[in-house]
């Protein structure tokens, strides 16, 4: 009677044992989905917008830019929603005719204010940046620059934003805003280690890219040399970001961007023609263009091969020779002549080249096009195709890109020629070391560019030092608080399955 | 701030040259014209020429063409203006000044006299 | 060439007073809808010191008594409460095409 007893007892205890387990086990796995979901559950995201407007000399795009306000120290959390391109030339081209920049910049401004929410539009900063065009026109005259950006400002003024104002910015500026841009969306300014990567090019170290950019007028090159000390003052810039300093080597060639080299090279081999016909190998056989001796002397760019012509025009007739046509660009470079210990061309400080290196702006463009940008092409097949490219005839470029403007496609031969006479020949990057160069036109969807760089540095959006933070954010805690809650709860059942064998387990109950 | 600081005064025997030395700081070199200005004794100021840094191409008044040389030391951030046969009338102070169109910013002068 | 004829030569104005002087160019001196026209003020021994720019812009540190007024081949710079460091020699210039010419100088003294 007494043995029936206790094992009652001790069926009943441990059925009720293993019952308040298994509700308690329920409930707390409950709970902790409960308490990962709510903790996580999209909550409404207070999000902030930036406008930059980058006045090139070519053309002038739009971007506009989103956070969330909550993280705005954190790296990486600021992406580009929107680019808009101004339809037209640069701003620097409408100095004889001002009054027309108010409806020039009509349509990107509107796209704006439709991308932007209302109630956002009055503390959305709109910031103007003009570069290397505009550098040139006041270099010409400061009076006719300052007349554009006063338009440009009063025009900008009008929309319902916050607008920061038009301004120049300087060669050093846009070297390392462009060098900010690519690094920050590359992440190098992390501190935390990633266990994965989404982000192209992205290596596991912390090494920051190197920047080349190039435009219509200027290229820039900025990057972290191995030795901190430098011989060129003007071209050292010192930056703490994260926690970190950096001392970087930037420089910006003016007049060395595609479109003003290519005037460089015209006035350059028109002083030696014997008539008023060039015959040009950067451009495609049975190609012709006539240009205005005016329009060739107008940019300061050509001031040193400028010379009285007994013609008021000549013509370009395109002979298609890669090979000349990379002679007679390497003329623009003066490389005999350096007083430190290592020179880019025309007696510009140059350390030696370090680490990996994002192209963007046009060397991206002109290499995309001619369908050279992939990590696998090496410098001599990319010499190989810029031959075959450049010895093709007009007629044929025409039908085979049937819908791109002859302006832009007859410079392609010339373009891609200079890109490799600069990088090759100006910034002494070798075959071997030509695989550390990335061409990049966007990153993580944000183009590369000295855009966001600015941006976030007039939005104090970059702090000199690391923000403090908990190790892991908190839904990467709730939701491994959550995974671990289960695992845990898997292996105790697990385990009182594989310790209690069934017989023994239920022995008790029989 | 913006600089320009110009070498010191020269006496010159007639038929000699002159080079006048001016050091900008405080500015991208490259970006902006350097012109000199000359001022003789109680005369008005007389333009003379300018340099684009950039790339040392100049651009003279007739009057000093094929006397006159403006050359660059980028490295150096100096311009330089040379003026060779000088006669008693080049007597004056030599200014370069950094601009465009707009001389806003200018040297201290170097007195050139030219004296037998 | 484009010539800059100042008027007049000298001028003496009681302190506090208005002075004006005038410049007149062989040519108009606007272009793209912008005056060539610069004011400079030069004290004995001194680089001369830009004034006014674009015809009617004051430069940087410039006080307000300084204006300037005008386009095309007249203008003219005012100052409206002369002061005793304002005495100097004022020049006229003109940058729309070289070679850049100066005017003749006024001279502006205390009476």
């Known amino acids: 009677m007494e043995d029936t007893k206790e094992s009652n007892v001790k069926t009943f205890c441990s059925k009720n044992i293993l019952a308040i387990l298994g509700f308690s086990s329920i409930i707390a796995v409950i709970a902790l989905l409960a308490v990962g979901l709510t903790q996580n559950k999209a909550l409404p995201e207070n999000i902030k917008y930036g406008i930059v407007l980058d006045a090139g000399s070519s053309h002038t795009s739009l971007y506009i830019y989103k956070w969330p306000a909550e993280k705005e120290n954190d790296t990486g959390v600021v992406h580009q929603v929107e680019e808009c391109r101004v339809k037209g030339p640069g701003i620097s081209k409408y100095v004889q005719k001002v009054n027309e920049i108010g409806i020039y910049l009509t349509d990107c401004m509107e796209r704006a204010r439709e991308v932007i929410p209302r109630s956002q539009h009055q503390e959305t900063p709109v910031y103007l940046g003009a570069t290397a065009g505009m550098r040139l026109l006041r270099m010409e005259s400061e009076e006719l620059a300052d007349r554009v950006l006063d338009v440009v400002e009063r025009s900008l003024s009008n929309y319902p934003f916050d607008f920061q104002g038009a301004r120049i910015i300087t060669g050093q500026e846009e070297g390392a805003y462009g060098w900010i841009t690519i690094n920050y969306l590359l992440g190098k300014f992390s501190q935390k280690t990633r266990w994965f990567s989404i982000v192209p090019y992205e290596t596991n170290n912390q090494e920051t890219f190197g920047a080349l950019d190039l435009g219509g007028a200027s290229t820039q090159i900025t990057f972290v040399p191995q030795n901190q000390t430098t011989e060129s003052p003007d071209n050292a810039l010192q930056f703490r970001l994260y926690g970190k300093d950096y001392n970087v080597y930037t420089h910006s060639f003016l007049c060395y961007g595609k479109d003003q080299a290519l005037w460089q090279k015209l006035a350059k081999d028109i002083q030696v023609a014997s008539n008023e016909i060039l015959r040009d190998p950067c451009f495609h056989p049975g190609y012709k263009k006539v240009v205005n001796v005016s329009d060739l002397y107008k940019t300061p760019c050509t001031k040193r091969f400028e010379m009285t012509l007994p013609f008021q025009q000549f013509e370009i007739q395109g002979i298609g020779n890669y090979q000349q046509c990379h002679q007679s660009v390497l003329e623009l470079f003066n490389t005999s002549y350096c007083p430190y210990s290592q020179c880019a061309f025309n007696g510009i400080f140059l350390p030696p080249l370090q680490g990996d290196f994002g192209a963007f702006s046009a060397f991206y463009f002109v290499m995309n096009f001619l369908n050279l940008t992939s990590e696998k092409v090496s410098q001599e097949k990319v010499t190989e195709m810029m031959k075959k490219f450049c010895s093709q005839p007009w007629e044929e470029i025409k039908t085979s890109y049937a819908g791109v403007k002859e302006k832009y496609l007859s410079e392609y031969c010339f373009s891609g020629t200079y890109i490799l006479s600069l990088l090759l020949q100006g910034y002494h990057f070798t075959a071997d070391s030509w695989e550390h160069i990335h061409f990049i036109g966007k990153i993580q969807g944000s183009d590369a560019g000295w855009t966001l760089g600015y941006m976030l540095n007039l939005t104090n959006m970059i702090p000199a030092e690391q923000p403090l933070s908990t190790p892991l954010s908190h839904s990467t805690y709730v939701f491994l608080m959550v995974l671990f809650s289960l695992v845990l709860v898997i292996v105790a059942i697990i385990g009182l399955l594989i310790f209690h064998k069934p017989s023994y387990f239920w022995k008790d109950m029989v | 701030q913006v600089q320009l600081v110009q070498s010191g005064a020269e006496v010159k025997k007639p038929g000699a040259s002159v080079k006048v030395s001016c050091k900008a700081s405080g500015y991208t070199f490259t970006d902006y014209n350097m012109h000199w200005v000359r001022q003789a004794p109680g005369q008005r100021l007389e333009w003379i020429g300018y340099i684009v840094p950039l790339n040392g191409g100049s651009t003279f008044n007739q009057k000093f063409k094929g006397r006159a040389t403006i050359t660059v030391d980028t490295s150096a951030r100096t311009a330089y203006m040379e003026l060779s046969s000088l006669r008693s009338e080049d007597t004056a102070v030599y200014y370069c000044?950094?601009?465009?169109?707009?001389?806003?910013?200018w040297g201290q002068g170097t007195l050139v006299t030219v004296s037998s | 060439d484009i010539v800059m004829t100042q008027s007049p030569d000298s001028l003496a104005v009681s302190l506090g007073e208005r002075a004006t002087i005038n410049c007149k160019a062989s040519?108009?001196?606007?272009?793209?809808?912008?005056?060539?026209m610069y004011w400079f003020q030069q004290k004995p021994g001194q680089p001369p010191k830009l004034l006014i720019y674009g015809a009617s812009n004051q430069g940087s540190g410039v006080p307000d008594r300084f204006s300037g007024s005008g386009s095309g081949t007249d203008f003219t710079l005012t100052i409206s409460s002369l002061q005793a460091e304002d005495v100097a020699v004022y020049y006229c210039q003109q940058t729309k095409e070289v070679p850049y010419t100066f005017g003749g100088g006024t001279k502006v003294e205390i009476k």
């Open positions: 040519e108009s001196v606007d272009n793209f809808g912008v005056s060539f």
């Open positions: 000044a950094r601009g465009g169109t707009r001389f806003a910013y």
